[in-house]
């Protein structure tokens, strides 16, 4: 009987996440007189086969980073080899897991700010990609600043934008930077996937050297 | 070896009927379609139609519909054709071949030639 | 139908001369489904080139065939008087399966 599973051949779409060993059928095609086997043709990569009898499967697990759409056409033969259905397009769609981890694109980071810039003016960015799908959380970047050295009286002079990666001053960095009582700060920054929400995330760090220039800009005398 | 083998030639008279047949030996009858092919003399090939004896299906050429009936007995490994309501112009060797998946006329009869004659 | 047209219909070839027939396909076919049978007179055709590339069991290494799309070929490298017959191509495409009107190659 026709269901969920099985039925005639027409364009169909299916949706399966990436990494999970292949466990079951994707479909089973019904054939109508003369067709007596079927053809599987298109983005296979030698993983999508079907059965002379019309069963559809993988059999090995995808990788939506490295195809996230198969795009597949599947026609019904005659005893002859002769296309007598379709072809007609199944597409499958490979549903993102989190299986990779954010990278920073640096190591190490350097740039240097003017004291007194005004607060939140980003001076420095830093960036990290992350291959898994940007649509979901999986993909979804959360950058923090993990340490500030050095730190004094338990003040942060630096803020970093969470989403964009971007580094600017706080008020009490604007304020009290100064180059002659400390002109270097090392950051160590932190960026997640799963927009930072889930204990399951993946995380990596680098390292951002700031060098603080002294504000040559002199009020007018009255 | 493979083979097929085809019956004996066939003299008819007009508007009638011949049925001649193709004995198969060598391979699994029902692996295989089975096709029958025209040629008159000094002419070239002219497909007439294919049967699956897997299944009984069977399929025409548009020239040959109302002329050619194909078919097939499993038990024997014999394919049949039968011409009905025979011209002058149905005078020729009929040749049955096996098909091959996806393939071509791998093997052929040594043909059956059919004589219309009033 | 797909239409199969030959040529030339008819040809003569010396011992040792190379000898090439043509098939022109009505509709761009893929070459796998394009074939060649020789036959002689008072016998049935037998498969000779499969495939447009691929001999047939005993078919001498001289024969070779080539061609893709709607343009296809049989070539002799060196006429033997053997090879004296009449040669046909054939599609496998899609239904009716129709031959070229055959090409008939004599000894000179």
């Known amino acids: 009987q026709e269901g969920k599973f099985s039925g005639p051949l027409k364009p169909m779409t299916f949706s399966i996440y990436e990494g999970q060993e292949p466990s079951q059928i994707i479909f089973q095609f019904k054939a109508n007189p003369p067709a007596v086997t079927f053809e599987l043709t298109g983005e296979t990569d030698n993983i999508f086969v079907i059965e002379r009898e019309g069963l559809l499967y993988y059999n090995r697990a995808l990788d939506r980073e490295t195809r996230s759409t198969h795009n597949l056409q599947v026609a019904a033969l005659d005893a002859n080899g002769i296309i007598v259905e379709g072809p007609v397009p199944i597409t499958i769609k490979v549903k993102d897991i989190n299986d990779n981890r954010p990278t920073f694109l640096q190591s190490k980071y350097e740039g240097s700010v003017r004291q007194n810039s005004r607060p939140g003016k980003p001076f420095l960015y830093v960036n990290a990609t992350d291959l898994d799908d940007p649509a979901t959380p999986n993909g979804q970047l959360y950058y923090q600043i993990v340490i500030q050295l050095p730190m004094i009286n338990n003040v942060m002079y630096f803020q970093i934008n969470n989403k964009t990666g971007a580094i600017s001053l706080t008020r009490e960095g604007s304020q009290e930077l100064n180059p002659a009582k400390n002109p270097s700060y090392n950051l160590v920054i932190s960026v997640k996937d799963m927009g930072g929400q889930s204990e399951n995330s993946f995380s990596d760090t680098t390292s951002v050297d700031i060098i603080v220039t002294e504000n040559i800009w002199k009020a007018p005398k009255p | 070896q493979v083979q097929l083998q085809q019956s004996g030639a066939e003299l008819a008279r007009p508007g009638a009927s011949v049925k001649m047949s193709c004995k198969a030996s060598?391979?699994?009858?029902?692996?295989?379609?089975m096709h029958w092919v025209k040629q008159r003399p000094g002419q070239g090939l002219e497909w007439i139609g294919y049967?699956?004896?897997?299944?009984?299906?069977?399929y025409y050429n548009q020239k040959f519909k109302d002329k050619a009936t194909l078919t097939a007995d499993k038990s024997s490994s014999t394919a049949y054709m039968q011409l009905s309501g025979l011209t002058s112009e149905d005078s020729t060797v009929y040749y049955c071949?096996?098909?091959?998946?996806?393939?071509?006329?791998?093997?052929w009869g040594a043909g059956t030639t059919v004589t219309v004659s009033s | 139908e797909i239409v199969l047209t030959q040529s030339p219909p008819l040809m003569a070839a010396s011992p040792g001369e190379k000898v090439t027939i043509t098939c022109s396909v009505s509709s761009s076919i893929s070459s796998s489904n394009l074939h060649w049978y020789q036959q002689k007179s008072e016998t049935s055709p037998k498969p000779w080139i499969y495939g447009t590339s691929n001999l047939a069991s005993g078919v001498p290494i001289r024969f070779s065939g080539s061609g893709s799309g709607t343009s296809y070929s049989l070539t002799i490298s060196s006429m033997e008087a053997e090879d004296a017959a009449t040669y046909y191509c054939q599609q496998w495409t899609s239904y009716p399966f129709t031959f070229g009107a055959g090409t008939k190659l004599e000894l000179k």
């Open positions: 071949a096996r098909g091959f998946f996806k393939g071509y006329f791998d093997v």
């Open positions: 060598g391979y699994t009858f029902t692996s295989y379609t």
């Open positions: 049967i699956d004896p897997k299944s009984d299906y069977n």
